[in-house]
């Protein structure tokens, strides 16, 4: 494996990380920031890329299939967090075939810095971005059903993640801004009929002193529908991360009275009609917070917590956050549990019997890396769980719930040395399936002065496609060292966030 | 106390560029997005674009794009406008303003008079 | 772009008198997009009615606004003397964000 100059290798950063993103299936597309290192590998006539991105969340979800760069930059309407990450990518060409870039895996950590940005010693704080945004699937839910209310090709939607939740107050109103993807759950189910997904966006906005938080003054909300079946069979085999990887993408529309505009543009004002909220979360739990106190004006927006949260993951990206299906978790073959290995190799949590706890939420805790603003891990590594799941996407998202018996299963690999996953009271571990290409991981938000921790780089060992030797294992351990001609230039417009990324790597 | 405090008038030749600034203080500068606007002697407002201080991400109005540039620097909390290529169209007053998710844009700035002169 | 048209230009009302000026835009606006500035000469605008109807902090509870789609519209219920400002309309439903041309309201 030789170090490579990273500006080189630009062409396939680039289209890796759009494979990834087509890989995911929850969050927000990843925009390229830097190429922080590179190596390459040539076995016959293949070469293997080693590949260190530091990336940034869009606001488009991931859903839209969009290519990286074509996400248009954030809607100002709407809070925009600041999240960002770094992945290690291995991929592989074939020489002759030079579009036929393969993602082989991949290995991700992200975290907001929006706190860590925000300068709040002088400000009164007026915007939060919650960790924890389960807690407002009743507003999800609440806003879907008005936007139902106006447009019947929505009927048979339903919530499935809550994606990102900001609060914004101050003066005289308190606005809650709601991001959740939905799926299309229609009662006759054809097998092979594959889900229609959406994102939406809804925003609440109160008046300050409104005690009755079921009625709020505005309600918008947009949707944007995304159908797969525009795209590849998602129930068959997709291809190993090569060749675009498509299971939604395409918003519908049509001449006639459209049943979705276009860009989610429909928007909905609801004056002073009731819609159900939960109570405001304690201001113990707040996650960062930032903002101007209102001027001359402007309303409120409203609180929202999860009472009862039925909701399963759909994703295989291990991703983001892990949601928790209270009624099924015992039987849902692809959940996503907080207690496989954390990204530091310990929980910062104590086990909950519910598992509410996601990767995502350390609001008791210490926080993971509070003392290694340098991006070491105390324990030398990150032992990160692969989270199982096989190629053949078996998708049980709000829909349904998931069989008792799981199919077959790919690869094998188990879960992380005694990290057994707990079920219910009484019940032995979780049988561990298929292990998944790819993962994400949400890490707490960043403080002042820390940078983001490196993600794993144990990649198992896998054999090149159309070897020789197809038991060999083709790949070599994930370069440790940085490459001379790296890391590469930041993109112009995110100089800000650049002091988050560690600039060399452990030798 | 939220205040927004742009620099001084401004008397420039045509071709030349200007840099305007607008400080930014009584609220976190890096998670709303700062607003420029233009308004040339008895005309009405004209949007020119907007940044988000914190990740650097900016939205420019077609119309401005070439002539505007925005930058920001969260360690003074202050936001930047750039116009470039001058000409005697470009004489207008320039306002930064906060844009308060959900209400408009709630605090401006005092405002910079630019003149382009030969 | 959505362009935003007030009218009248120019209007002139007696102390007392009700005032209603429009603001007409070319494709819809969600209500919860639309604002309405007041801007006085010598000064900056400042936020008088956010989301079309909820007048901003300090704002006489003479002033009101209504409306939906595309038509929008500013009253004031009785002129007072410091109304006397030129007034803006303002929608951010799409980028880029417009605003209107102005009302400018006098004393007659």
């Known amino acids: 494996v030789s170090p490579t100059d990273c500006s080189a290798v630009e062409p396939e950063a680039e289209k890796a990380l759009d494979l990834i993103n087509k890989r995911r299936r929850d969050g927000y597309l990843f925009q390229l920031l830097r190429i922080a290192d590179a190596h390459l590998d040539r076995v016959e006539n293949t070469t293997v890329y080693y590949l260190v991105l530091d990336v940034q969340e869009s606001d488009c979800s991931v859903l839209s299939r969009k290519y990286w760069n074509d996400c248009e930059p954030p809607d100002s309407r709407r809070p925009s967090e600041i999240v960002i990450g770094q992945c290690k990518v291995i991929a592989t060409r074939h020489s002759h075939e030079s579009q036929d870039l393969r993602v082989i895996d991949f290995n991700c950590t992200t975290s907001s810095v929006s706190s860590a940005l925000a300068n709040t010693k002088d400000s009164p704080v007026l915007i939060d971005f919650f960790e924890d945004t389960e807690r407002y699937r009743k507003q999800a839910n609440k806003a879907l059903e008005k936007y139902k209310e106006e447009n019947d090709d929505f009927a048979s939607f339903r919530v499935d993640r809550i994606e990102r939740v900001a609060r914004v107050r101050g003066g005289e109103g308190t606005g809650y801004f709601v991001d959740f993807s939905v799926r299309n759950c229609p009662r006759h189910h054809f097998p092979r009929h594959p889900n229609v997904f959406g994102f939406c966006r809804a925003d609440l906005f109160y008046d300050v002193e409104a005690l009755d938080l079921e009625s709020p003054k505005n309600l918008v909300i947009n949707c944007e529908v995304f159908d797969p079946q525009e795209h590849e069979n998602i129930n068959g085999v997709p291809p190993h991360l090569g060749h675009p990887f498509h299971w939604g993408g395409h918003e519908r529309s049509s001449t006639t009275k459209p049943p979705f505009k276009p860009h989610g543009s429909r928007d909905h004002h609801h004056p002073h009609k009731p819609h159900e909220h939960g109570p405001p979360p304690p201001p113990d739990e707040r996650d960062h917070s930032h903002g101007p106190p209102l001027p001359q004006g402007p309303p409120p927006l409203l609180p929202m917590s999860c009472s009862s949260c039925q909701h399963a993951t759909f994703g295989t990206n291990g991703a983001q956050r892990h949601s928790h299906n209270n009624n099924s978790s015992d039987l849902h073959p692809h959940k996503h549990h907080s207690h496989e290995q954390h990204p530091h190799g310990h929980h910062p949590h104590a086990h909950h019997p519910h598992e509410h706890d996601t990767h995502r939420q350390h609001p008791h805790g210490h926080h993971p890396h509070g003392h290694h603003p340098h991006g070491h891990h105390p324990h030398g590594h990150h032992p990160h769980g692969h989270h199982p799941h096989c190629h053949d996407f078996q998708d049980y998202g709000p829909c349904d719930p998931p069989p008792h018996n799981q199919g077959h299963c790919c690869h094998g690999h188990g879960p992380p040395p005694g990290h057994l996953r707990r079920r219910g009271p009484g019940k032995g571990p979780r049988p561990f399936h298929c292990r998944q290409i790819g993962s994400v991981y949400r890490l707490p938000p960043l403080r002042k002065g820390e940078v983001l921790p490196l993600p794993e780089a144990n990649f198992p060992s896998f054999p090149l496609p159309h070897h020789k030797h197809p038991l060999k294992p083709d790949n070599q351990p994930f370069p440790q060292s940085v490459s001379e001609s790296c890391p590469g230039k930041f993109k112009s417009g995110f100089p800000q966030v650049s002091m988050f990324f560690t600039h060399t790597f452990p030798k | 106390q939220v205040q927004l405090q742009q620099s001084g008038a401004e008397l420039m030749k045509p071709g030349a560029s200007v840099k305007i600034s607008c400080k930014a203080t009584g609220y976190t500068f890096s998670t709303f997005w700062m607003e420029w606007v233009k308004q040339r002697p008895g005309h009405g407002l004209e949007w020119i674009g907007e940044?988000?201080?914190?990740?650097?991400?900016?939205n420019y109005n077609e119309k401005f794009k070439g002539k505007a540039t925005f930058t920001a620097d969260t360690s003074s909390n202050t936001a930047y406008m750039q116009l470039s290529s001058l000409t005697s169209e470009d004489s207008a007053v320039y306002y930064c303003?906060?844009?308060?998710?959900?209400?408009?844009?709630?605090?401006w700035g005092q405002g910079t008079l630019v003149t382009v002169s030969a | 772009d959505n362009v935003l048209t007030q009218s009248p230009a120019i209007m002139s009302a007696s102390l007392g008198e009700r005032v209603t000026m429009t603001c007409t835009a070319s494709?819809?606006?969600?209500?919860?997009?639309l604002h309405w500035y007041q801007q006085k000469p010598g000064s900056s605008p400042k936020l008088w009615i956010y989301?079309?109807?909820n007048l901003a902090s300090g704002v006489p509870v003479r002033f009101s606004g209504s409306g939906s789609g595309t038509s929008y519209s500013l009253t004031i219920s009785s002129m007072e003397a410091e109304d006397a400002a030129t007034y803006y309309c303002h929608q951010y439903h799409r980028s880029p964000w417009t605003f209107g041309g102005g009302t400018k309201l006098e004393i007659k």
């Open positions: 940044i988000l201080p914190g990740s650097g991400n900016a």
């Open positions: 494709s819809s606006v969600s209500s919860s997009y």
């Open positions: 303003a906060i844009h308060y998710y959900g209400y408009g844009f709630a605090y």
């Open positions: 989301t079309t109807s």
